[in-house]
C-alpha cells in the first residue's frame, strides 16, 4: 500500500491500491482489508475471498456500493470508499491470506488515512452566472473567490476555463506551487500582459483581459483544487468549480456618412466631410481612407485611393489632395483645383483598431460610406455661335458656303480652345421625327472626323471643311445637289485644358439652323421657229430661225437638231422624219442624214446668239417639201467641263410647200414576153406617162431602177437589178448566174430592160421605180417624188 499518509476531504472518494509481489502461490491472489480507527483494534472491512468476512457495519455499505473492491490485476486490488466521512479516518490494512505455503516475507501492509472537513469555499455560487456584454477591444475582468479553512497546510490551485459550445479551453492557471500556466493559444497574450491572473485581498482571484477579442466569447468557469504535501509529494485532495460569467462580445457599431450629392465649380476646392458614428469611446484608433470611383460602387475595380489617415494619424495622399480631421468623428477630404476628371463617386472607408498585446493592433470594426456623388461644374466659357450662308445655291450644282462664327465674350484665355461639329437635318415633310446627321466633328486636338453622309464627298473634294479665321469655321459644298437641300447647323465646343495638358470638353453651343433651299420647279424650255422670207420658189434658199427661252435651268447652253417631216405617198403610213443637221452645245456642226451628195454644202446651221439659231438650205428642190422643226436640248454645266441634260423641246413646224401646176408622172411595166423558155430573151418596158403641163423633153430627165422578186424567193425583198440615172449612166448589180442584163432608154418616156440567156432564176415579178427631174424656170433641176 502507499507509504505516505493519504489525506482526503469529507465527501470525496478514497481509493487505496494494494499489490503483492515475489510469491510462489497461485497467480491470482486474494486480498483482505481491515480498518482501525485511531487507538482501536482492526475490524474486518472487505475481502475478495470470503463473503462473510466484513463486519456488520461494513456489510451494509458494501451492499449499497459505498465500499467496493476493484481488482486491477492478478496481484493487485483497489479499495474504494465513496463519500468518505470523518469516521473513515484511521489505518487501513491490506493482507493476502493464501499467498505461500510457507512464510517468506511480509503478507500485510498498513496505510494511514486522514479525513478532513470540507473547508474549501469557492464562489460566487449565488445566482446563475451573469452575462457580460462588451465590445471587441474593451477590457473585462472576472473574479472568483477561493478559501480553505483546513487545519493542515494546504495549497490552492486555480484554473480559468472558457466554454464555447462543446469546446473547452484553458485560459490561465495558477498551480499549487505558485506557477502560472497560460492555456494553448493564450501564451502570447499572457506574456504581453493582455491576459493576467492576480489575487485581490486574501481569497479573490481576478482574471483580467485588457483587450477582448471575439474569440473570448463564452462561459467562464473557475476551477479550484486543494493540494497537500505528504512526505515531499503533492497530492490533490479535492476540486471545486463554479460558473462565473458568460461573456458576449458585441459587434461594434460603426457608420461612416458623407454628403450624398456635391457640386463644385471647376478650379475650386472640393471639401468632403466624413462623419463617423460609433459606440466606441475607448482607446480605439480610426484609420480613414478616402477613395474615388467613376461608378457608384466602391467594390468595382477601378476604385482608387486618394488619401489615407493611418491609426498613427499620419496622412498619405496623392497630389492636390489633403486629408484632415477636426475631431475624432469628422474627417475632411480636400481636393484642390478640381477638374472634370474629379467628377465621380467618393467613399469614406473607416476601420477602428484596438491595441492588442505586444504593441500589436487588431481591427474591431469597419465601415464604408455610401457614395458622395460629386459633379464638377464648369466656369463655362461664355460665347455665342452664329451661322450664316455666305453662298446660297439657286440651282442644283451651285456651290453652298456656310460660315459658323464664334462670338466669344470671356474666353480669350489660353486654356480654352474651340472646335466645331457640322450637322445636317432634312427638311420636315411631316410630323415624323427627323434625326440630325453628323457631317463632321472636330476633336479637342482639331483632328476632323467625317460622318457617314459626308465621308465620300469630302474625299472627292466636294465637301470642304475649313477654318479661315480664328473665330470662324467654314463649310463649303462645291456642287449642291437636290439631296443637299435642308437645314444645316453648327455646334461649337469649348475645350478646357487640364492639369495633365489634356483637353476636356466643357461646353457646347448650338447655332440656329440655316435652310438651304431652292424651288424645284420644272425646267421650262420654249423654242419658237420662224421663216423670215415666207414666199419662195424651188431653187431658192430656205431660211428658218429658232429662238430659245428657258426657265429654272442654270447657265443653260443649247444644242439644236434640224429635222424634217416628209409626207409619204401612202396616206395610211406615218410621215417619215429625217434628221438633217445638228449643232451641239459647244457649237460643233454635224450632218445627220443628209445624203444628197450633190448638195453636201447645201445646208447650214449656225448660232446667231446664245439663244438663237439659223438654218439655211440652198437650191431647194420640190423634194425638200415637208415640215421643218428645231429640236433644242438645254444643258447645264456639271463639274467644270461636264454637262447635264436639263430639258429638250421641239419648235413649231415651218412648212416647205411648192405650189406648182407642174406635171404628174406615172410609171407602168409592159412585157412582150411574159412567158419564156429557159435561154430566151426577156424584154421588159418601163413606160412613163405625163399628165398636166406639157413639158419640153429637154426639161425632163429620169432616174430609172429595175427591181425583181424572183420566183425562188417570193417572200424576199425586191432585188435591184439595174439602174440608169438622169445623165444616162447605167449601173448593174452583180449576179450569181449566167444570164446578162441590159438597160437602155428607147424613147423619151420608155426604158427597156432585157435579160439575155434567161435562166430559171430570172423567172419572177419585175417592176420599175422612176424619179423624175424637171428643170425649173430658174434653170435648176428639181427632183420630183419617186413613182413605182
Amino acid at each position: 500500500v502507499p507509504t505516505a499518509t493519504l489525506v482526503r476531504v469529507v465527501g470525496t472518494e478514497l481509493v487505496i491500491p494494494c499489490n503483492v509481489s515475489d510469491y510462489d502461490g497461485p497467480s491470482e491472489q486474494n486480498f483482505d482489508w481491515s480498518f482501525s480507527s485511531l487507538g482501536s483494534s482492526f475490524v474486518e472491512l472487505a475481502s475478495t475471498w470470503e463473503v462473510g468476512f466484513p463486519a456488520q457495519l461494513y456489510q451494509e455499505r458494501l451492499q449499497r456500493g459505498e465500499i467496493l473492491l476493484r481488482r486491477t490485476a492478478n496481484d493487485a486490488v483497489e479499495l474504494h470508499i465513496k463519500n468518505v466521512q470523518p469516521s473513515d479516518q484511521g489505518h487501513y490494512k491490506c493482507s493476502t491470506p493464501s499467498t505461500d505455503a510457507t512464510v517468506q516475507g511480509n503478507y500485510e501492509d498498513t496505510v494511514q488515512v486522514k479525513v478532513l472537513a470540507d473547508s474549501l469555499h469557492v464562489g460566487p455560487s449565488a445566482r446563475p452566472p451573469p452575462s457580460l456584454s462588451l465590445r471587441e477591444g474593451e477590457p473585462f475582468e472576472l473574479r472568483c473567490t477561493a478559501a480553505s479553512a483546513s487545519p493542515l497546510h494546504t495549497h490552492l490551485a486555480l484554473l480559468w476555463e472558457v466554454h464555447r459550445g462543446p469546446a473547452r479551453r484553458s485560459v490561465l492557471a495558477l498551480t499549487h506551487e505558485g506557477r502560472f500556466h497560460p492555456g494553448l493559444g493564450y501564451e502570447q497574450r499572457y506574456h504581453s500582459g493582455d491576459v493576467r491572473l492576480d489575487t485581490v485581498g486574501s481569497d479573490a482571484y481576478r482574471l483580467s483581459v485588457s483587450r477582448a477579442l471575439s474569440a473570448d466569447q463564452g462561459s467562464y468557469r473557475c476551477i479550484v483544487s486543494e493540494w497537500i504535501a505528504e512526505q515531499g509529494n503533492w497530492q490533490e485532495i479535492q476540486e471545486k468549480a463554479v460558473e462565473v460569467a458568460t461573456v458576449v462580445i458585441q459587434p461594434s457599431v460603426l457608420r461612416a456618412a458623407v454628403p450624398k450629392n456635391v457640386s463644385v465649380a471647376e478650379g475650386k476646392e472640393l471639401d468632403l466631410t466624413c462623419n463617423i458614428t460609433t459606440d466606441r469611446a475607448d482607446d480605439v484608433r480610426p484609420e480613414v481612407t478616402w477613395s474615388f470611383s467613376r461608378m457608384p460602387d466602391s467594390t468595382l475595380p477601378g476604385s482608387r485611393v486618394l488619401a489615407r489617415l493611418d491609426r498613427d494619424s499620419l496622412v498619405h495622399s496623392s497630389p492636390h489632395v489633403a486629408l484632415s480631421h477636426v475631431d475624432a468623428r469628422s474627417y475632411h477630404l480636400l481636393v484642390r483645383d478640381v477638374s472634370k476628371e474629379n467628377s465621380g463617386y467618393y467613399y469614406c472607408h473607416v476601420s477602428l483598431w484596438a491595441p492588442g498585446h505586444n504593441r500589436s493592433w487588431h481591427k474591431v470594426a469597419e465601415a464604408v460610406s455610401s457614395p458622395a456623388g460629386v459633379g464638377v461644374t464648369w466656369l463655362e466659357p461664355d460665347y455665342q455661335v452664329y451661322l450664316n450662308a455666305s453662298k446660297v445655291p439657286g440651282f442644283a450644282d451651285d456651290p453652298t458656303e456656310l460660315a459658323c462664327r464664334v462670338v466669344d465674350t470671356k474666353s480669350g484665355e489660353a486654356n480654352v480652345r474651340f472646335t466645331v461639329s457640322w450637322y445636317y437635318r432634312m427638311n420636315r415633310r411631316s410630323d415624323n421625327v427627323v434625326t440630325s446627321e453628323l457631317l463632321a466633328v472636330m476633336d479637342g486636338d482639331w483632328t476632323l472626323k467625317y460622318g457617314e453622309r459626308s465621308k465620300q464627298r469630302a474625299q472627292d473634294g466636294d465637301f470642304i471643311f475649313s477654318k479661315e479665321h480664328t473665330d470662324t469655321f467654314n463649310f463649303r459644298i462645291q456642287r449642291t445637289t437636290e439631296e443637299d437641300r435642308g437645314n444645316y447647323y453648327c455646334v461649337v465646343s469649348a475645350w478646357t485644358k487640364q492639369r495633365n495638358n489634356s483637353w476636356v470638353k466643357s461646353k457646347d453651343v448650338f447655332s440656329k439652323p440655316v435652310n438651304i433651299f431652292w424651288a424645284l420647279e420644272d425646267s421650262v424650255l420654249v423654242v419658237k421657229a420662224r421663216q423670215p422670207k415666207p414666199f419662195f420658189a424651188a431653187g431658192n434658199t430656205f431660211e428658218m430661225t429658232c429662238k430659245v427661252s428657258s426657265k429654272n435651268i442654270k447657265s443653260p447652253r443649247y444644242s439644236v437638231l434640224i429635222m424634217a417631216e416628209k409626207p409619204v405617198g401612202d396616206l395610211s403610213s406615218p410621215n417619215e422624219t429625217k434628221y438633217i443637221i445638228s449643232l451641239d452645245q459647244d457649237s460643233v456642226v454635224k450632218l445627220e442624214n443628209w445624203t444628197d451628195a450633190s448638195r453636201v454644202d447645201g445646208v447650214v446651221l449656225e448660232k446667231v446668239q446664245e439663244d438663237e439659231f439659223r438654218y439655211r438650205m440652198y437650191q431647194t428642190q420640190v423634194s425638200d417639201a415637208g415640215l421643218y422643226r428645231c429640236m433644242v436640248t438645254a444643258w447645264s454645266p456639271v463639274r467644270g467641263s461636264l454637262w447635264r441634260e436639263a430639258a429638250t423641246s421641239l419648235s413649231n413646224p415651218i412648212e416647205i410647200d411648192f405650189q406648182t401646176s407642174g406635171p404628174i408622172f406615172n410609171a407602168s411595166v409592159h412585157s412582150d414576153t411574159p412567158s419564156v423558155i429557159r435561154g430566151d430573151l426577156i424584154k421588159l418596158f418601163c413606160i412613163i406617162t405625163v399628165e398636166g403641163a406639157a413639158l419640153d423633153p429637154d426639161d425632163m430627165a429620169f432616174d430609172v431602177s429595175w427591181f425583181a422578186v424572183h420566183s425562188f424567193g417570193l417572200d424576199k425583198a425586191p432585188v435591184l437589178l439595174s439602174s440608169l440615172d438622169r445623165k444616162g449612166i447605167v449601173t448593174t448589180s452583180r449576179r450569181d448566174w449566167k444570164s446578162d442584163l441590159s438597160l437602155e432608154r428607147v424613147s423619151v418616156l420608155e426604158f427597156l430592160l432585157q435579160v439575155h440567156g434567161s435562166e430559171d432564176q430570172d423567172f419572177g415579178n419585175y417592176y420599175c421605180s422612176v424619179t423624175p427631174w424637171v428643170k425649173s424656170p430658174t434653170g435648176s433641176w428639181q427632183k420630183e417624188a419617186e413613182i413605182h
Epitope: H121, V122, G123, P124, S125, A126, R127, P128, P130, S131, E141, L142, R143, C144, T145, A147, V200, G201, D203, A204, Y205, R206, S219, V242, E243, V244
Partner: antibody
Framework: QLQLQESGPGLVKPSETLSLTCTVS??????????WDWIRQPPGKGLEWIGT???????YYNPSLKSRVTISVDTSKNQFSLKLNSVTAADTAVYYC??????????WGQGTLVTVSS | DVVMTQSPLSLPVTLGQPASISCRSS???????????LNWFQQRPGQSPRRLIY???NRDSGVPDRFSGSGSGTDFTLKISRVEAEDVGIYYC??????????FGQGTKLEIK
C-alpha cells in the same frame, strides 16, 4: 437572523453624488454564496434593480445606470456601499439593499428614502 | 434586457376568494443549467419587499401554503387560494436567469373588495 440596514443622507442636491451604505449583521459578507444588491423604488412606482457586488470584488450594474453607479465592498466592516453621481429629481426613491443567492433576493433592508432637491 | 409584464395591474378580491396574478417574460427564463430563476415578492404597505416564491414554485420558509407559484418558459402565475386581509399589498415578479440586469415586473396591486 441576517439583517441589512441602509444608511446615508436623506437629501441630496441635484448634480451631486448620492452615497449610501448597507451594514450586514447576523452573517458574513465574505460568504462565497451571496451577492449583495441595491434596489430602488421611486414614490408610488415599481422596483428597479441598480446593481450588485460579490465580496471578491465583482460588480454588475444595470446598463441604464452603469455610467453613474459604483458599488464597493468593505469586508472588514461587513458593509457594501452605493454611489450614484450626477443625480436629478428622477433619482428620488426609497433605496433598498438586499442579499442575493442562487434563488433570488432573500433578505432586504427596510429601505431609506433619498430625496433629490435643491 | 428581459422585460417582465404583469397583469392585472390592479386586482380587487373578496376575502376568502382565490386570486391569480400573471407574469410574462419577453424571453424564455430557462437557464442553460435547466433552472428557471423566477421570484415572487410581496410588498405590504409601508414595508420592504418579502420573497414568497423562488425558482417558479418553491415557497420560502414562513410563507403560508395558500400561496403557490407555477409556469414555464415565458408564462408564470402566482395564485392565492383564499385571500386574507393581510395579503393586501403589491406583488412583484422578478427574474435573475438573464442578468445583468435583474428585472422586475411593474407590480400588481391586490386590494379587498
Amino acid at each position: 437572523q441576517l439583517q441589512l440596514q441602509e444608511s446615508g443622507p436623506g437629501l441630496v442636491k441635484p448634480s451631486e453624488t448620492l452615497s449610501l451604505t448597507c451594514t450586514v449583521s447576523g452573517g458574513s459578507i465574505s460568504s462565497s454564496s451571496y451577492y449583495w444588491d441595491w434596489i430602488r423604488q421611486p414614490p408610488g412606482k415599481g422596483l428597479e434593480w441598480i446593481g450588485t457586488i460579490y465580496y471578491g470584488g465583482s460588480t454588475y450594474y444595470n446598463p441604464s445606470l452603469k455610467s453613474r453607479v459604483t458599488i464597493s465592498v468593505d469586508t472588514s466592516k461587513n458593509q457594501f456601499s452605493l454611489k450614484l453621481n450626477s443625480v436629478t429629481a428622477a433619482d428620488t426613491a426609497v433605496y433598498y439593499c438586499a442579499r442575493g443567492n442562487s434563488y433570488g433576493l432573500d433578505y432586504w433592508g427596510q429601505g431609506t428614502l433619498v430625496t433629490v432637491s435643491s | 434586457d428581459v422585460v417582465m409584464t404583469q397583469s392585472p395591474l390592479s386586482l380587487p378580491v373578496t376575502l376568502g376568494q382565490p386570486a391569480s396574478i400573471s407574469c410574462r417574460s419577453s424571453q424564455s427564463l430557462v437557464h442553460s443549467d435547466g433552472n428557471m430563476y423566477l421570484n415572487w415578492f410581496q410588498q405590504r404597505p409601508g414595508q420592504s419587499p418579502r420573497r414568497l416564491i423562488y425558482k417558479v414554485s418553491n415557497r420560502d420558509s414562513g410563507v403560508p401554503d395558500r400561496f403557490s407559484g407555477s409556469g414555464s418558459g415565458t408564462d408564470f402565475t402566482l395564485k392565492i387560494s383564499r385571500v386574507e386581509a393581510e395579503d393586501v399589498g403589491i406583488y412583484y415578479c422578478m427574474q435573475s436567469t438573464h442578468w445583468p440586469p435583474v428585472t422586475f415586473g411593474q407590480g400588481t396591486k391586490l386590494e379587498i373588495k
